[in-house]
Amino acid sequence: GIDSGGQALPDSFPSAPAEQLPHFLLEPEDAYIVKNKPVELHCRAFPATQIYFKCNGEWVSQKGHVTQESLDEATGLRIREVQIEVSRQQVEELFGLEDYWCQCVAWSSSGTTKSRRAYIRIAYLRKNFDQEPLAKEVPLDHEVLLQCRPPEGVPVAEVEWLKNEDVIDPAQDTNFLLTIDHNLIIRQARLSDTANYTCVAKNIVAKRRSTTATVIVYVNGGWSSWAEWSPCSNRCGRGWQKRTRTCTNPAPLNGGAFCEGQACQKTACTTVCPVDGAWTEWSKWSACSTECAHWRSRECMAPPPQNGGRDCSGTLLDSKNCTDGLCVLNQRTLNDPKSRPLEPSGD
């Protein structure tokens, strides 16, 4: 083989016979070149008489290898470890669609073994998001979908969402749902979900923030129940009465709509007028009684009190001595059934 420095490498290496094929204790791992920092690839095999790196099918120059050798205490067989550095320039110089790769080849007297291929990529994270979240105004208890497509990057960016700069954890708040395509779903928007939401994309190179989307959770106003009708404006006859309601069930919040319709209702009313009671004329005096008194009466019926009118004041009955204080009537006359009763006389 020919290395990149034009130096010949043997196709096989001599070694003592009867060894097993090399076995890799450590294989090179995929790696990313961040900014201009080269990556180190490591390889360890045993038993191994020689171990070299091959990158993109070409042997790496021997001077590019840092090799260490040790003995396995149990078997006494040689363990070989090798390390190389791959620079950004080397990776950039590889033209074509294929990724830059390296693998280890280890030799023993029984033959060669190849390690896995480790792919080396230049890490980056573009500046602009493919899709940024948009501001939303949603009614209370409704669903919200915020979309985010992070910038292209290698390795692919991880995405997290911030609510007012705090990381959203759907395991802690099950009202949030994160999807594989980086959408954030608010299952039932609460007033406390009114906030600024930011999509954050990050990888080993950088961290990018999307524009912030303000989500406003609003409440449309709702009417309270109607209050009782007010008393009629006129105590007597035709008037008006009204009842009111307020836009407080709930009150509009965060720009929610005010209640539609009237806060006050008016209607005509007629109240029957109260009629105060008045006395009838006094009756004629009664006949003189055994007690030498006569009586007269009247009624609160001219008219009677109506619709809450006042009752008559004064007495129903009036009595007066009918003999000017002399009560000496003939016993017989008073007791004679044939005797005429006393005529009632006027006042």
Epitope: E143, L145, P170, L178
Partner: antibody, heavy 115, light 106 residues
Framework: EVQLVESGGGLVQPGGSLRLSCAAS????????MHWVRQAPGKGLEWVAS????????SYADSVKGRFTISADTSKNTAYLQMNSLRAEDTAVYYC????????WGQGTLVTVSS | DIQMTQSPSSLSASVGDRVTITCRAS??????VAWYQQKPGKAPKLLIY???SLYSGVPSRFSGSRSGTDFTLTISSLQPEDFATYYC????????FGQGTKVEIK
């Protein structure tokens, strides 16, 4: 009260088209994602498509991509599933469901694709 | 797509039994898993969302839990009305459902 009512199912020949409707009441469809899920006779549930009108977001299962189109008319509070190039394997009861939690479902409408 | 492997496919149980149904996601789905109950000729009904949150109106004998990519639905004491088919569903990626578990009377 939240209600979803599907309609538009029926018998159609392979290669034919059908448009399913999902009339929503009791909530504003504009602010919710709506989903179509189907169930072949005697089989399990399979998600078909989703829409979220407010964000102009749509998504489809690979099995229907390019053949089915989900849409919504928010003035009618109705979601639709336009199904073209129908195949025998599309035979199923089609349900519409509300929100990512799929908390409310319609009663379903049967689509039979057969010659 | 993310696969949801549900087990068992069917089970026989008696009223009062404790019943456990499991679902394993083929990759991480966070806690974006829901459980549904379906009776013959009827639409599915939501029982559990976000792996462990009980949906309103669902009896407290139903519960959900998560351990990594394994999700469990437990019915603590089976009632006559619980005999049905149960499905798990993930909503982290494009929605996928488990194959279903039919709970039958022993």
């Amino acid at each position: 009260e939240v209600q979803l009512v599907e309609s538009g199912g029926g018998l159609v020949q392979p290669g034919g088209s059908l448009r399913l409707s999902c009339a929503a009441s009791g909530f504003n469809l504009y602010y919710y994602s709506m989903h179509w899920v189907r169930q072949a006779p005697g089989k399990g549930l399979e998600w078909v498509a989703s829409i979220y009108s407010y964000s102009s977001y749509t998504s489809y299962a690979d099995s229907v991509k390019g053949r089915f189109t989900i849409s919504a008319d928010t003035s009618k509070n109705t979601a639709y599933l336009q199904m073209n190039s129908l195949r025998a394997e599309d035979t199923a009861v089609y349900y519409c469901a509300r929100s990512y939690a799929m908390d409310y479902w319609g009663q379903g409408t049967l689509v039979t694709v057969s010659s | 797509d993310i696969q949801m492997t549900q087990s068992p496919s069917s089970l026989s149980a008696s009223v009062g039994d404790r019943v456990t149904i499991t679902c394993r996601a083929s990759q991480s789905v966070s806690s974006a898993v829901a459980w549904y109950q379906q009776k013959p000729g009827k639409a599915p009904k939501l029982l559990i969302y976000s792996a462990s949150s009980l949906y309103s109106g669902v009896p407290s004998r139903f519960s959900g839990s998560r351990s990594g990519t394994d999700f469990t639905l437990t019915i603590s004491s089976l009632q006559p009305e619980d005999f049905a088919t149960y499905y798990c569903q993930q909503s982290y990626g494009p929605f996928t459902f488990g194959q279903g578990t039919k709970v039958e009377i022993k």
